[in-house]
Interface confidence: medium
């Protein structure tokens, strides 16, 4: 934990601390923006993104967005601040260690999004119902 002699003030966006005084460094996420994907009708997929980036700010989390329309399938991988909406949606699962896809209503396409807060967690995106957050074991993992 932060030693008592360390001043607890923080600079804007530079440091985030938890209740125990541990310091949050910026997270590592897959960050390929939007790429064409072959991920379809699977319980889970790897992002196939070769770029691991350190997020700009410590509060940012990893995000993945899967979209399918009549023409193609894309997968977007980025860092994003969970206090701000992404694609007009709140990142409600940002504390999850795994990227568990949730369907969002978007006209003209099938749209899934997930967010998560462990290093490179948006590399493995999970569609399977087994991981739905109605599962109490997963809730324990998320909120521990």
């Amino acid at each position: 934990t932060i030693p008592p002699h360390v001043q607890k003030s923080v600079n804007n966006d530079m440091i985030v601390t938890d209740n125990n005084g541990a310091v949050k460094f910026p997270q590592l996420c897959k960050f390929c923006d939007v790429r064409f994907s072959t991920c379809d009708n699977q319980k889970s997929c790897m992002s196939n993104c070769s770029i691991t980036s350190i997020c700009e700010k410590p509060q940012e989390v990893c995000v993945a967005v899967w979209r399918k329309n009549d023409e193609n399938i894309t997968l977007e991988t980025v860092c994003h601040d969970p206090k701000l909406p992404y694609h007009d949606f709140i990142l409600e699962d940002a504390a999850s260690p795994k990227c568990i896809m949730k369907e969002k209503k978007k006209p003209g396409e099938t749209f899934f999004m997930c967010s998560c807060s462990s290093d490179e967690c948006n590399d493995n995106i999970i569609f399977s119902e087994e991981y739905n957050t109605s599962n109490p074991d997963l809730l324990l993992v998320i909120f521990q």
Epitope: T1, D18, N20, G21, A22, V23, K24, F25, P26, Q27, L28, T52, P58, P97, S117, S118, D119, E120, C121
Partner: nanobody, 120 residues
Framework: EVQLLESGGGLVQPGGSLRLSCAAS????????MGWVRQAPGKGLEWVSR????????YYTDSVKGRFTISRDNSKNTLYLQMNSLRAEDTAVYYC?????????????WGQGTLVTVSS
């Protein structure tokens, strides 16, 4: 008991170099991501750099990119920060920290710090 002991700080002129070391004990060093944090006088904390357990992936805050190099020697349980082209704004107490849990970005356990003063 986890212990982190920093050394190597001192007074250096602008443009000069220093190498900080952090001797670690009380945990499995080779399986743990490590990092450096600094605190300038009267300012808040700023993360500086982090390195993965094997030392193959390193990350830096923008203000030190191209000037600082983080490295580690797992056989000696030691973390390093090579600081080149030092500027007055690098003046701070530098702390090494260990990652709390593999895959998480929270770093707990710090050392007592080593003071770096950049002044002519």
């Amino acid at each position: 008991e986890v212990q982190l002991l920093e050394s190597g700080g001192g007074l250096v002129q602008p443009g000069g170099s220093l190498r900080l070391s952090c001797a670690a004990s009380g945990f499995t060093f080779e399986n743990t991501s490590m990092g450096w944090v600094r605190q300038a006088p009267g300012k808040g904390l700023e993360w500086v750099s982090r390195i993965d357990p094997k030392g193959s992936h390193t990350y830096y805050t923008d203000s030190v990119k191209g000037r600082f190099t983080i490295s580690r020697d797992n056989s000696k349980n030691t973390l390093y920060l090579q600081m080149n082209s030092l500027r007055a704004e690098d003046t701070a107490v530098y702390y090494c920290a260990k990652q709390r849990e593999l895959g998480k970005s929270y770093f707990d356990y710090w050392g007592q710090g080593t003071l770096v003063t950049v002044s002519s």
